[in-house]
Interface confidence: low
């Protein structure tokens, strides 16, 4: 009779983690008996995944009954694969012997490859916001997958960027890969309402990436401008003086008005009005009694923008002349006045 | 010998619905992931959908996702497409194709049945 | 999606010359290519896959070779039988996308 062969027909295995994978292994003979053990590797550091004769496998279960004297095929079956159980997996046939069986024979072996679906992309940003003009990185990481072809894209409000560089670790042979990849992005005063998008495509997402975003208002700081005027009121010897504020974000602001470098009033603006493009404006005014005044008085409108150093702008106060209309107030919003003598 | 038969391929007005069948024989059906290939007339080749060996995994051409849906009964050896909203340009030969390696993912297909023409049109 | 590039669209042939197909990937997609043949009125007919592995009871004079994102498809000695269609696939990113296809004819 022709000796015993064991047959691994499949030469590789391909299994989707969290599914099953099914090794499939006949023998072409019932002689001689004796005992199956399949294990992953070859060699003295072999590890044991299934022993007919004894032991407890609970991911294991055979696909026929193996305790029928005329059962053939040892095939097997691993429930809930994952990365780490990728590997070559033997089904090696034993001979029966005393005290100790001998191994007998051994299949060619099935690769088994474990597609694991990548982690969602997490994209960071810069720790400190930055102001336009200004190049920022972001990065994207994304972990676990396999096997280790992946595909990453960076958008920026639909628009494929192009200056990122990205890498997939480790280099050589692992039972599952991670993604990490660094964009550079040039920041525009538009950039409030802007996204920042990783986009991952791998084999087992069956063709609908995976997606991680930054919201550039996280990263952004845009500078307010300044300008100050002055009009009249009813009352002739009253000036109405503005310091309008615009285009700044985020909206954490703080004004400062001095007269003649002296510390009149300091408020933090609440009620702004918010532009299309995401930006912030917002209006402080004074109420200027000139009547009782002899000399030119100097105005200065400081402002301390998100605890960056402050900005300011001033305007001159001429007391001796009658106040000419000069610029217009356009904010219907106004914050509320401060009517102030000075003497 | 490893054969596959489609059937259930006709003419099919816009918006309507057909389902096609694959029946398997001369080998262990449940062993294989199966798919659906279409061919436009005097076109070239076009994956439309795939399924693992127990069906727990599906994937979709964008072109029929959500009109489409793969299916299959291990105990009947049959596969099946279900096809609703039907278009003009789903026009085609539908094959029905095998994976080479068993329990393994959509890659390779073969062998292929012979096709079914599915006509769509008013 | 991947794109597929097949060139050239058709080539004219006698018996016995070596033909070369090519398919470009657009991105890449290491050895998970196929290649098929077609002829008319029938079902594709896989002969290579794997880039290079050559399918069980295709004739030798049939080749593969390549890997990432340019493969070539080889007929060592055109056979009359081997006029037809062949089409290039890959299958490691869903969707799976065939080439265009290269047409082979008697010259």
């Known amino acids: 009779e022709e000796e015993l062969q064991v047959i691994q027909p499949d030469k590789s295995v391909l299994v989707a983690a969290g599914e099953t994978a099914t090794l499939r292994c006949t023998a072409t003979s019932l002689i001689p008996v004796g005992p199956i053990q399949w294990f992953r590797g070859a060699g003295p550091g072999r590890e044991l995944i299934y022993n007919q004769k004894e032991g407890h496998f609970p991911r294991v279960t055979t696909v026929s009954d193996l305790t029928k004297r005329n059962n053939m095929d040892f095939s097997i079956r691993i429930g809930n694969i994952t990365p780490a159980d990728a590997g070559t997996y033997y089904c090696v046939k034993f001979r029966k012997g005393s005290p100790d069986d001998v191994e007998f024979k051994s299949g060619a072996g099935t690769e088994l490859s474990v597609r694991a679906k990548p982690s969602a992309p997490v994209v960071s940003g810069p720790a400190a916001r930055a102001t336009p003009q200004h190049t920022v990185s972001f990065t994207c990481e994304s972990h676990g997958f396999s096997p280790r072809d992946i595909t990453l894209k960076w958008f920026k409000n639909g628009n494929e960027l192009s200056d990122f560089q990205t890498n997939v670790d480790p280099v050589g042979e692992s039972v599952s890969y991670s993604i990490h990849s660094t964009a550079k992005v040039v920041l525009t005063r538009e950039d409030v309402h802007s996204q920042v998008i990783c986009e991952v495509a791998h084999v087992t997402l069956q063709g609908d990436p995976l997606r991680g975003t930054a919201n550039l208002s996280e990263t952004i700081r845009v500078p307010p401008t300044l300008e100050v005027t002055q009009q009249p009121v009813r009352a002739e010897n009253q000036v109405n003086v503005t310091c309008q504020v615009r285009k700044f974000y985020p909206q954490r602001l703080q004004l400062t008005w001095l007269e003649n470098g002296n510390v009149s009033r300091t408020e933090t603006a609440s009620t702004v009005t918010e532009n299309k493009d995401g930006t912030y404006n917002w209006m402080s005014w004074l109420l200027v009694n000139v009547s009782a005044h002899r000399d030119d008085v100097k105005l200065t409108c400081q402002v301390e923008h998100d605890g960056q150093p402050a900005v300011s702008k001033s305007h001159d106060l001429k007391v001796s002349a009658h106040p000419k209309e000069q610029g217009s107030n356009t904010a219907a919003e106004n914050t509320g006045s401060n009517e102030r003598n000075i003497y | 010998q490893v054969q596959l038969v489609e059937s259930g391929g006709g003419v099919v007005q816009p918006g309507g619905s057909l389902r096609l069948s694959c029946a398997a024989s001369?080998?262990?059906?449940?062993?294989?992931?199966m798919s659906w290939v279409r061919q436009a007339p005097g076109k070239g080749l076009e994956w439309v959908a795939s399924?693992?060996?127990?069906?727990?995994?599906?994937y979709y051409a964008d072109s029929v996702k959500g009109r489409f849906t793969i299916s299959r009964d291990n105990s009947k050896n049959t596969l099946y497409l279900q096809m609703n909203s039907l278009r003009a340009e789903d026009t085609a030969v539908y094959y029905c194709?095998?994976?080479?390696?068993?329990?393994?993912?959509?890659?390779?297909?073969?062998?292929w049945g012979q096709g079914t023409l599915v006509t769509v049109s008013s | 999606d991947i794109q597929m590039t097949q060139s050239p669209s058709s080539v004219s042939a006698s018996v016995g010359d070596r033909v070369t197909i090519t398919c470009r990937a657009s991105?890449?997609?290491?050895?998970?290519l196929a290649w098929y043949q077609q002829k008319p009125g029938k079902a594709p007919k896989l002969l290579i896959y794997?880039?290079?592995s050559l399918q069980s009871g295709v004739p030798s004079r049939f080749s593969g070779s390549g890997s990432g994102t340019d493969f070539t498809l080889t007929i060592s000695s055109l056979q009359p039988e081997d006029f037809a269609t062949y089409y290039c696939?890959?299958?490691?990113?869903?969707?799976?996308?065939f080439g265009g296809g290269t047409k082979v004819e008697i010259k």
């Open positions: 194709a095998r994976g080479v390696e068993t329990y393994s993912g959509p890659n390779w297909f073969d062998p």
């Open positions: 001369g080998f262990t059906f449940s062993y294989y992931g």
């Open positions: 399924i693992w060996v127990d069906g727990s995994s599906k």
């Open positions: 991105q890449g997609i290491s050895s998970w």
């Open positions: 794997a880039a290079s």
């Open positions: 696939q890959q299958a490691i990113y869903f969707p799976i996308t």
